[in-house]
């Protein structure tokens, strides 16, 4: 459920309207990513990858369709990636789902999570 703890976590990630975090990624008209992803933080790249996967998995984003897709999105790829994906979804599924349902772009969703500040470490 959208518990008080969730609200605290989400608020902590809210974008400051005056200090929005600029990212290098941009979505093309088909929702494809036009970006030099290696220049972005690992968390942001993870977010973009997962959100793009979810977008491709649903015909029309609704609470139900995105939630159903979210249970399958981390099933493919190497085990290390699956762990990263599951951890990300545990933290952000509600917010990612809400963003997709509202028609936010992958870039907007991931920026709003303040994940576009470069971070170190492998994906």
């Amino acid at each position: 459920r959208l518990s008080p703890e969730y609200y605290d976590l989400a608020r902590a990630h809210l974008r400051d309207e005056e200090k929005s975090c600029p990212c290098l990624a941009q979505e093309g008209p088909q929702g494809d990513l036009l970006t030099k992803t290696q220049e972005l933080g690992a968390d942001y790249r993870t977010c973009l990858t997962i959100v793009q996967k979810l977008k491709k998995m649903v015909d029309k984003p609704t609470q139900r369709s995105v939630s159903n897709a979210a249970t399958r999105v981390c099933r493919t790829g190497r085990s290390a990636w699956r762990d990263v994906c599951r951890n990300f979804m545990r933290a952000y599924q509600s917010r990612v789902t809400q963003g997709l349902v509202a028609g936010e772009t992958a870039q907007q969703i991931c920026e709003d999570l303040r994940l576009c500040i470069p971070s170190t470490g492998p994906l």
């Epitope: 959208l2 969730y6 609470q63 369709s65 789902t97 028609g103 936010e104």
Partner: antibody, heavy 123, light 111 residues
Framework: EVQLQQSAAELARPGASVKMSCKAS????????MHWVKQRPGQGLEWIGF????????DYNQKFKDRTTLTADKSSSTAYIQLTSLTSEDSAVYYC????????????????WGQGTSVTVSS | DIVLTQSPASLAVSLGQRATISCRAS??????????MHWYQQKPGQPPKLLIY???NLESGVPARFSGSGSRTDFTLTIDPVEADDAATYYC?????????FGGGTKLEIK
Amino acid sequence: EVQLQQSAAELARPGASVKMSCKASGYTFSRYTMHWVKQRPGQGLEWIGFINPNSGYTDYNQKFKDRTTLTADKSSSTAYIQLTSLTSEDSAVYYCARHPIYSDYGPYAMDYWGQGTSVTVSS
Amino acid sequence: DIVLTQSPASLAVSLGQRATISCRASESVDSYGNSFMHWYQQKPGQPPKLLIYLASNLESGVPARFSGSGSRTDFTLTIDPVEADDAATYYCQQNNEDPWTFGGGTKLEIK
């Protein structure tokens, strides 16, 4: 104070078009989707669809898709609905209502509504 | 489309008594632990007003006499005790699936 100010009542001929507006104030326009709801005299509520002012994404109820266009102007914080090829069935009150993109922006439902615009289609 | 059936269509309740309105969905409106069901109050000539969101959360400024409960397909709006100002039509609404849909409404009369 949050306000959604809708345009004045419209009287139109069958086959004509109308464009109604909903000017938002008192909140960050881009953090909310704008929804439109139809209410025929003495009847219940029907959801028409919504627009995300951030991304331009629109989601329509299939029932209204063919003759309805939703737009938004971020610079003036105004949302619009255009109805074409009007018939007597379009005579109704049309409400705009905001809905937060994310649940930490506010109650995750249509929490503020405009006063409604009455449309009368008559020859 | 998810059909929301409200019952009763109308009811008359004495001042100070409890009013209970039911909303049944044709399929579940639950996703990731939330029930995407909301309740609105509408008085003649006015726009709807949000009372309860996500099945059981009281909207800010709404009296605690109003409460919501339920999950999946069965939901209830309770007003206890009823006051004269509560005379209105009440609608449930779901946004778990497109198109978003409303119940047919329940008209509450105060005796």
